[in-house]
């Protein structure tokens, strides 16, 4: 059974991940972002189901495409370089989902824009956090 300290750690990691994803979304949606129309041509795959921490595997698999889109902005809308930002997210995701479990991600048929993709994972984080508090 999870201890209160491990639950607290999970909650903090999820909150950190949530803030990172929200920061990216805000940077993309910034009215000064001249690359938005091009960014919105990038296609992302969404999980068929995302209700447990193991489903973060689906996010992990889409981090490389996410970095490529963020590279378009050339850090103008972000405090960190895309590589560093994605690296930070990757570390959190690996810790949260656990590396010992091998979960095969199932994706929905429909593709999503970067905005839809980020909103989906933001909702995921908020949902899991609410079950922990």
């Amino acid at each position: 059974a999870p201890t209160s300290s491990s639950t607290k750690k999970t909650q903090l990691q999820l909150e950190h991940l949530l803030l990172d994803l929200q920061m990216i979304l805000n940077g993309i949606n910034n009215y000064k972002n001249p690359k938005l129309t091009r960014m919105l041509t990038f296609k992302f795959y969404m999980p068929k189901k995302a209700t447990e921490l193991k489903h973060l595997q689906c996010l992990e698999e889409e981090l490389k495409p996410l970095e490529e889109v963020l590279n378009l902005a050339q850090s103008k809308n972000f405090h960190l370089r895309p590589r560093d930002l994605i690296s930070n997210i990757n570390v959190i995701v690996l810790e949260l989902k656990g590396s010992e479990t091998t979960f095969m991600c199932e994706y929905a048929d429909e593709t999503a824009t970067i905005v839809e993709f980020l909103n989906r994972w933001i909702t995921f984080c908020q949902s899991i956090i609410s079950t922990l508090t």
């Epitope: 001249p34 129309t37 091009r38 960014m39 041509t41 296609k43 490529e68 889109v69 378009l72 050339q74």
Partner: antibody
Framework: EVQLVQSGAEVKKPGASVKVSCKAS????????IQWVKQAPGQGLEWMGA????????RYIQNFKGRVTMTRDTSTSTVYMELSSLRSEDTAVYYC??????????????WGQGTLVTVSS | DIQMTQSPSSLSASVGDRVTITCITS??????MNWYQQKPGKAPKLLIY???TLRPGVPSRFSSSGSGTDFTFTISSLQPEDIATYYC?????????FGGGTKLEIK
């Protein structure tokens, strides 16, 4: 080897429609945007629009909106560009070309051989 | 739409010459500039893409520089097989736009 093979030359009357095909091979068809470029005789290059074969999403330039339709058939890895209400200034070579990298919009790396469309009464 | 001003529209040079083509954009496009070579009756060929990156297999005599609004394409030592029309393309935002082209001829 990546290849884009286009349909043959067409001669059309003003007001008619033309449908140019572009058959892709040598890569994962559904994960690269296919873009279309027009080149009128002796003129430069003009970007027309694009389609993402994975979901059929399209982008069209304002000049062609309403007259151009891009579609795809994933079973045959073929993209189509249909231009309606043809006029003499539509006489051109039309190229399909693949985006340099997957998922998003980049410059075009591989190109079809071009299809000459002649509009003449 | 982003406007592209490519110059010169034509130029004549001798084998071994250094050749320079410029492209100026109406807005800042970072380094999202690409350069194509087109020979008569053929499809354009991508030589250099975003970030002044030379495509694999393209001879090193071709290079480019610039970011923001001012871009330069250079052939360090013109070869007979370089006779073609060259185009710049901005891939910063939609719709993509091409420069008017530069027709290169041998003196």
């Amino acid at each position: 080897e990546v290849q884009l093979v286009q349909s043959g030359a067409e001669v059309k009357k003003p007001g008619a429609s033309v449908k140019v095909s572009c058959k892709a091979s040598g890569y994962t068809f559904t994960t690269y945007w296919i873009q279309w470029v027009k080149q009128a005789p002796g003129q430069g290059l003009e970007w027309m629009g694009a389609i993402y074969p994975g979901d059929g999403d399209t982008r069209y330039i304002q000049n062609f909106k309403g007259r151009v339709t891009m579609t795809r058939d994933t079973s045959t890895s073929t993209v189509y560009m249909e231009l309606s209400s043809l006029r003499s200034e539509d006489t051109a070579v039309y190229y399909c070309a693949r985006s340099l990298a997957t998922r998003g919009f980049y410059a075009m790396d591989y190109w079809g051989q071009g299809t000459l469309v002649t509009v003449s009464s | 739409d982003i406007q592209m001003t490519q110059s010169p529209s034509s130029l004549s040079a001798s084998v071994g010459d250094r050749v320079t083509i410029t492209c100026i954009t109406s807005t800042d496009i970072d380094d999202d500039m690409n350069w194509y070579q087109q020979k008569p009756g053929k499809a354009p060929k991508l030589l250099i893409y975003e970030g002044n990156t030379l495509r694999p297999g393209v001879p090193s005599r071709f290079s480019s520089s610039g970011s923001g609004t001012d871009f330069t394409f250079t052939i360090s030592s013109l070869q007979p097989e370089d006779i073609a029309t060259y185009y710049c393309l901005q891939s910063d935002n939609l719709p993509y736009t091409f420069g008017g082209g530069t027709k290169l001829e041998i003196k």
